[in-house]
Amino acid sequence: APISSHCRLDKSNFQQPYITNRTFMLAKEASLADNNTDVRLIGEKLFHGVSMSERCYLMKQVLNFTLEEVLFPQSDRFQPYMQEVVPFLARLSNRLSTCHIEGDDLHIQRNVQKLKDTVKKLGESGEIKAIGELDLLFMSLRNACI
């Protein structure tokens, strides 16, 4: 089971209208450039077999991957939103740095790996798709971690 006290974000992190709006604007702009609407990264498959108490830990993994493998490499695109949203998400990632799971997290790593593989397989369009789903990442992170 997760060490729940560390797998938590304060509600106030998600009660900042300006950065929430910028995150959703960034997602909207990127989704307009996403021509692969059949695939969804953040959906039922990602959470399959994951209990309520493990959801935040899973979302931490997704957040870290999105920052390191998608947002940082694409940081010159979708301005001015990107330069504001990336530091915000990086702060959330930092706050979840002590969120760990005691015991087996293989089922979670397997689910996250499928998301990573999908993004990598799609190449740059996979990265655009991930940015286009930042609204879902934001909301899923909120719902899982507060």
């Epitope: 089971a1 509600k11 998600f14 953040i42 959906g43 039922e44 959470f47 399959h48 077999g49 994951v50 209990s51 309520m52 108490s53 959801r55 879902l136 909301m139 899923s140 909120r142 719902n143 899982a144 507060i146």
Partner: antibody, heavy 119, light 112 residues
Framework: EVQLVESGGGLVQPGGSLRLSCAVS????????MIWVRQAPGKGLEWIGI???????YYASWAKGRFTISRDSSKNTVYLQMNSLRAEDTAVYYC?????????????WGQGTLVTVSS | AVVLTQSPSSLSASVGDRVTITCQAS??????LAWYQQKPGKAPKLLIY???TLASGVPSRFSGSGSGTDFTLTISSLQPEDFATYYC??????????????FGGGTKVEIK
């Protein structure tokens, strides 16, 4: 094909107990949480409680103490134990699968089983 | 606990009409809102989640919008099979789990 079938409803006297069953097929209870919802005659939907993948249970405040959700994964069945029943517990009781997609959504639902509490 | 207020509680409409149902939350629920359709004697059926995402197999004449506290379900051109009762449902996280899932009172769509 995913299917949920409730059973165990019927007529029970005030103060009595009843155990409802929800038999599932087409998916595993180790992969999905399950909820119970009820609907009094001519009224709206009311959430009762949920049993998570790991067996943890959570209840609506009004249901705590009288209602208990459990499961038997080997039988692919979820149960709702109802005690100290009152006339106002008369309702159709539904089970549904909880699909978390970043937010909880309930799909599909069973056909429901009617519980009538009357003397 | 969040309270969801649906309006109207009932409405009469004709086939082909555009129908709009609203759901107001007593607190900010972001986009954590779903819509369900229920026909007499049947179980509810998921129509929309994330306030605006159409569930699999649901006709495109159904659409949802809104965020925060005000939400709308629209049927662009009412069909005979759409006469039913519609419920909004919210998920509220971060509070006590005993009030996580809440349903609105329902809106009955009847034939004019």
């Amino acid at each position: 094909e995913v299917q949920l079938v409730e059973s165990g409803g019927g007529l029970v006297q005030p103060g009595g107990s009843l155990r409802l069953s929800c038999a599932v097929s087409g998916f595993s209870l180790s992969s999905y949480a399950m909820i119970w919802v009820r609907q009094a005659p001519g009224k709206g939907l009311e959430w009762i409680g949920i049993i998570d993948i790991d067996g943890s249970t959570y209840y609506a405040s009004w249901a705590k103490g009288r209602f208990t959700i459990s499961r038997d994964s080997s039988k692919n069945t979820v149960y709702l134990q109802m005690n100290s029943l009152r006339a106002e517990d008369t309702a159709v009781y539904y089970c549904a699968r909880d699909r978390f997609v970043g937010v909880d959504i309930f799909e599909p639902w069973g056909q429901g089983t009617l519980v009538t509490v009357s003397s | 606990a969040v309270v969801l207020t649906q309006s109207p509680s009932s409405l009469s409409a004709s086939v082909g009409d555009r129908v709009t149902i609203t759901c107001q939350a007593s607190e900010d629920i972001y986009t954590n809102l779903a819509w369900y359709q229920q026909k007499p004697g049947k179980a509810p059926k998921l129509l929309i989640y994330w306030a605006s995402t159409l569930a699999s197999g649901v006709p495109s004449r159904f659409s949802g919008s809104g965020s925060g506290t005000d939400f709308t379900l629209t049927i662009s051109s009412l069909q005979p099979e759409d006469f039913a009762t519609y419920y909004c449902q919210a998920c509220v996280y971060g509070n006590s789990a005993d009030s996580r899932y809440t349903f609105g009172g329902g809106t009955k769509v009847e034939i004019k």
